[in-house]
């Protein structure tokens, strides 16, 4: 099966949400690993991640189509301390596959404000830090 | 579990220089930022200085910069503080904590390490 | 930079009195976290994001706010509540700041 893997960024309020989605067949589920990672452009790994999610089949799921699982990490202020590169991989300890996402970045500006840039399709997102609102 | 032990304090001459160090253990050290800060004797907490996960980017409060350096070594899972020209109001315990990477709290904190400037 | 202002500064309570700290932003902020220290101990996160316990916090702790104006509140005193009690936000660019700390004694 086809078997891929996206980054995508959402806010609420203060919170900036980082969203790892991996789409696969319902029986490729069994252990998949998803993770994201922060720059580590080599050995971005479930050990030296941030967060990692572990797949499970759900038996509640009908049919072979295509399912996605997602992993969200949920940052409650950006500061510049969250400045880098990170990157949404996935893995799977059952076929081998690996998966690495584009990496992605969170750039925290001098003004106060934050942007999140490298995410495919309209995900260039720019963040104003003090309002909480998407400019 | 979660360990950072602080070393390198002491007494110190004003104008001395001092470099603090700070020991971490069970965690992912490379991964987190990591801060240190200060308590003066029988006074409040107060931020000093803070240090991106990598190592490249540095923060400070205003009344240290230019006087403190804050800087660590992700292979020796080790931060650091060195302060120069020492001055009496440095007197204090001097705490190393990690920064919890979803929130603005500093989630774990070291037992300290005392310094007294005095001549 | 934005001044946290608590109160009291020290507070006797007795076991079982429900007892508020308050802390007070000379801005709006977004979140407080408090810590609580023990004499000759370290600080302990004790409530972080205004209102979440941390790990291991008796439930007789709550946290509240919003704004300029937040709020710890112990249910029913206890013994072991006997400690100094510190607020703490963030905001850019000065960073972190620290309130001057609430003193709690077990009357």
């Known amino acids: 099966g086809c078997i891929n893997i996206t980054s995508s960024a959402s806010q609420e309020g203060t919170r900036l949400n980082l969203i790892c989605t991996v789409w696969h067949k319902k029986e490729e589920a069994e252990g998949f690993v998803v993770f994201l990672c922060k720059d580590r452009s080599g050995d971005c790994s479930p050990e030296t991640s941030l967060k990692q999610l572990r797949l499970k089949r759900d038996p509640g799921i009908d049919g072979v189509g295509e399912i996605s699982s997602q992993l969200m990490f949920t940052i409650s202020q950006v500061t510049p301390l969250h400045s880098g590169t990170y990157q949404c991989c996935a893995r799977s300890q059952k076929s081998g596959i690996r998966l690495q996402g584009h990496f992605f970045s969170i750039l925290f500006t001098e003004t106060g404000n934050y942007t999140v840039t490298g995410l495919k399709q309209r995900q260039h997102l720019e963040f104003s830090h003090n309002e909480g609102t998407l400019s | 579990e979660v360990q950072l032990v602080e070393s390198g304090g002491g007494l110190v001459q004003p104008g001395r220089s001092l470099k603090l160090s700070c020991a971490a253990s069970?965690?992912?050290?490379?991964?987190?930022?990591m801060a240190w800060v200060r308590q003066a004797p029988t006074k409040g907490l107060e931020w000093v200085a803070s240090?991106?996960?990598?190592?490249?980017?540095?923060y400070y409060r205003d009344s240290v910069k230019g006087r403190f350096t804050i800087s660590r070594d992700n292979a020796k899972n080790t931060q650091y503080l060195h302060i120069d020209g020492l001055r009496s109001e440095d007197t204090a315990t001097y705490y190393c904590?990690?920064?919890?990477?979803?929130?603005?709290?500093?989630?774990?904190w070291g037992q300290g390490a005392s310094v007294t400037v005095s001549s | 930079e934005i001044i946290l202002t608590q109160s009291p500064t020290t507070m006797t309570a007795s076991p079982g009195e429900k007892v508020t700290i308050t802390c007070r932003a000379s801005?709006?902020?977004?979140?407080m976290h408090w810590y609580q220290q023990k004499p000759g101990a370290s600080p302990k996160p004790w409530i972080y994001?205004?209102?979440k316990l941390a790990s291991g916090v008796p439930d007789r702790f709550s946290g509240s706010g919003s704004g300029t104006s937040y709020s710890l509140t112990i249910n029913n005193m206890e013994a072991e509540d006997a400690a100094t009690y510190y607020c703490?936000?963030?905001?850019?660019?000065?960073?972190?700041?620290f309130g001057a700390g609430t003193k709690l004694e077990l009357k």
């Open positions: 904590a990690t920064h919890n990477y979803e929130s603005t709290v500093f989630d774990y």
């Open positions: 069970g965690f992912i050290f490379g991964n987190y930022a």
């Open positions: 240090v991106n996960s990598g190592g490249g980017n540095t």
């Open positions: 801005s709006s902020v977004s979140y």
């Open positions: 994001e205004t209102s």
């Open positions: 703490q936000q963030w905001n850019y660019p000065s960073m972190y700041t």
